[in-house]
């Protein structure tokens, strides 16, 4: 359930991604799949940092949700888990009311 | 009926251990997150911590990190408060509650009675 | 972390005021706030969750409203057993719990 592939551990490390605010981020990557296993256990929004959202292509074949939690660990969901698709509309209406969703690009090498 | 019964408070020394259980009865218990909250005597309540649902997450807030460690065990439908090296600080009435939700509606309305756990030398 | 001002710390008031009470919070949690009522010796009741939203068994003169980071809980004409401590709750970054205002009777 809280499996991260090798990809997306040496990505942790080796990132300089500043800091953004707000919780959605969407990530255009040259990687291959990250996610090795998927949850779709439901983990309430109060102890969810950030979302990263990972658009198929560039080697990988689906769409892919990585949740960083308050406390400090990582989890792959399934995109299609209800929660997790209510929880990103809510945030996306919240941020085109403020914010807008960040987008970073990773140049393709 | 939704039902939270606190254990195990009483008097230690600082640098001491305690334990404290919750026994839940009433509702499924592994359907919910659960927390402990704690409120010093006189004062206001502060969240301690929160587990999932078949407690493979967990979370603190920062003066207990390392120090208290929050679990359950589905089968008996209880949930525990292991804390260790206790300071005079940490003296209050503990309480455990519901908190799971997905649209807000079941956070922390379940409450137990609470157990008093006092750190004095 | 999150911050909650609760305001006033005490009231005084009679039965049949209306009361109302202020949480603040130091970032905009949208409608993710709690109101409970806790009475001497006893655990919290929890009156209004989501900002708005009234407990089942809770009488109607308790109300909430607020959104990002203002939020009040108000009593539209108190009643005896009303006199007990509240305490807001935001919920949408872990927890952290208003200070509290003392209810008291006039």
């Known amino acids: 359930m809280k499996f991260i592939s090798t990809s997306l551990l040496l990505m942790l490390l080796v990132s300089s991604l500043s800091p953004v605010q707000g919780v959605l981020e969407v990530y255009y990557t040259s990687l291959r799949c990250r996610c090795v296993q998927e949850s779709s256990v439901f983990i309430p929004r109060r102890f969810i940092d950030r979302i990263q959202i990972l658009p198929r292509g560039n080697g990988c074949p689906r769409k892919e949700i990585i949740v960083w939690k308050k406390n400090k660990s990582i989890v792959c969901v399934d995109p299609q888990a209800e929660w997790i698709q209510r929880m990103m509309e809510v945030l996306r209406k919240r941020s085109s009311s403020t914010l807008p969703v960040p987008v970073f690009k990773r140049k393709i090498p | 009926e939704v039902q939270l019964v606190e254990s195990g408070g009483g008097l230690v020394q600082p640098g001491g251990s305690l334990r404290l259980s919750c026994a839940a009865s009433g509702f499924t218990f592994s359907d919910y997150y659960m927390a402990w909250v704690r409120q010093a005597p006189g004062k206001g309540l502060e969240w301690v911590a929160s587990i999932n649902y078949d407690g493979g997450d967990t979370y603190y807030r920062d003066s207990v990190k390392g120090r208290f460690t929050i679990s359950r065990d589905n089968a008996k439908n209880s949930l525990y408060l292991q804390m260790n090296s206790l300071r005079a600080e940490d003296t209050a009435v503990y309480y455990c509650a519901t908190e799971e939700d997905y649209d807000g509606s079941y956070v922390m309305d379940a409450w137990g009675q609470g157990t008093l756990v006092t750190v004095s030398s | 972390d999150i911050q909650m001002t609760q305001s006033p710390s005490s009231l005084s008031a009679s039965v049949g005021d209306r009361v109302t009470i202020t949480c603040k919070a130091s970032q905009n949690i949208n409608k993710e706030l709690t109101w409970y009522q806790q009475k001497p010796g006893k655990a919290p009741k929890r009156l209004i969750y989501?900002?708005?939203i009234l407990q089942t068994g809770v009488p109607s003169r308790f109300s909430g409203s607020g959104s990002g980071t203002e939020f009040t809980l108000t009593i539209s004409s108190l009643q005896p057993e009303d006199f007990a401590t509240y305490f807001c709750l935001q919920q949408s970054s872990l927890y952290t719990f208003g200070q509290g205002t003392k209810l008291e009777i006039k």
């Open positions: 989501n900002t708005n």
